[in-house]
Interface confidence: low
Amino acid sequence: FYDIETLKVIDEEWQRTQCSPRETCVEVASELGKSTNTFFKPPCVNVFRCGGCCNEESLICMNTSTSYISKQLFEISVPLTSVPELVPVKVANHTGCKCLPTVPRHPYS
Amino acid sequence: FYDIETLKVIDEEWQRTQCSPRETCVEVASELGKSTNTFFKPPCVNVFRCGGCCNEESLICMNTSTSYISKQLFEISVPLTSVPELVPVKVANHTGCKCLPTVPRHPYS
């Protein structure tokens, strides 16, 4: 049999695994789709993105609201022709998440 | 121009984005490769997995040491023939990570 304490522990873990905004490491260049001769240093930033589990396989954890936060990064052009420049880079930050039905793909898409 | 305080903020963020064990939501069934008629409730657990950024594109964040931690979960077989049973499930927990060269793929693999 199982006691209430065990159930509480399981329930707490389940709450923590559920779909919610989570701090995530995001690669800036791929996020912004920058040209290959432009690099950002650091190449990654921490932002919140939706992640975690949904109760059903037919649901997916999706963002329902997004803010954009500005991160100061060095933008470096190769070949390096000047001192690396500090630029503000806007990155999407998920502020709300929900388990939503996966979009059915058209068979010919 | 940029001052040292700005650099410190950037440096702290960079440290936080680097390859390290991070709390991650893992789907138990796919992790254990269980048959499709066996379900776990909760379906997901929190463990540490290697994640984050490496300095070079040729490197990937990989686990260098792993422990296995036991999680108490309900194992449910379909069709349901008995009361869901609490079972201990061992899940890999990354305890050390390193940026390692990506394994070169054989052209015919």
Epitope: E75, S77, T81, V83, P84 | F1, D3, I4, L7, I10
Partner: antibody, heavy 117, light 112 residues
Framework: QVTLKESGPGILQPSQTLSLTCSFS??????????VGWIRQPSGKGLEWLAN???????YYNPVLRSRLTISKDTSNNQVFLKISIVDTADTATYYC?????????WGQGTLVTVSA | DVVMTQTPLSLPVSLGDQASISCRSS???????????LHWYLQKPGQSPKLLIY???NRFSGVPDRFSGSGSGTDFTLKISRVEAEDLGVYFC?????????FGGGTKLEIE
């Protein structure tokens, strides 16, 4: 508070190698984006950028002098070094160490180097 | 290399006068990212250069508002609206758009 201080031999003879040391405080060369460089100024003349080294050990040299310059760092001791090989009298100048930001904000007081036979 | 040409070489002024120093570059100082990395420094006798103006028009912290920078492309100017005794010294323009980073030959501001 950022400070940089240069030290060198003072006087040396033509064809010798000039070794300069920059000791700094108030920042670390392990900090992301940080750089330290060298600039020189012959007496009564203009300024010439020589070289700089970045936190990740990338090095950049003035192309005109590249073959004679070597820059290196000791991050744990907060020091940067510059070597200029085969000096001649044209290398007589005050040598400044700078924290490399865009533009240069923090400079050392400079060290005078005289190349004389 | 980008050649930075400063004029005049020497600028005699009376205290309270306006002073104007010109700096011309051999090629455009507009970086690919849109910024123009043209800076002005003042060097007093026996001292290292001190930053006055960065990126053409921006006064560095602590620099009095009697100093102003202007210009674009290849032509730049530093103006001092009312010269004070502490402003005397050698003024250098500098570019950090192109490697190697280069400096002007200097303009000596002195009392006439």
């Amino acid at each position: 508070q950022v400070t940089l201080k240069e030290s060198g031999p003072g006087i040396l003879q033509p064809s010798q190698t000039l070794s300069l040391t920059c000791s700094f405080s108030g920042f670390s060369l392990s900090t992301y984006g940080m750089g330290v460089g060298w600039i020189r100024q012959p007496s009564g003349k203009g300024l010439e950028w020589l070289a700089n080294i970045w936190w990740n050990d990338d090095k950049y040299y003035n192309p005109v002098l590249r073959s004679r310059l070597t820059i290196s760092k000791d991050t744990s001791n907060n020091q940067v070094f510059l070597k200029i090989s085969i000096v001649d009298t044209a290398d007589t100048a005050t040598y400044y160490c700078v924290q490399v930001t865009n533009p240069f904000v923090f400079w050392g007081q400079g060290t005078l180097v005289t190349v004389s036979a | 290399d980008v050649v930075m040409t400063q004029t005049p070489l020497s600028l005699p002024v009376s205290l309270g006068d306006q002073a104007s120093i010109s700096c011309r570059s051999s090629q455009s100082l507009v970086h690919n990212n849109g910024n123009t990395y043209l800076h002005w420094y003042l060097q007093k006798p026996g001292q290292s250069p001190k930053l006055l103006i960065y990126k053409v028009t921006n006064r560095f912290s602590g620099v009095p508002d009697r100093f102003s920078g202007s210009g674009s492309g290849t032509d730049f100017t530093l103006k001092i609206s009312r010269v004070e005794a502490e402003d005397l010294g050698v003024y250098f323009c500098s570019q950090s758009t192109h490697v190697p980073w280069t400096f002007g030959g200097g303009t000596k501001l002195e009392i006439e």
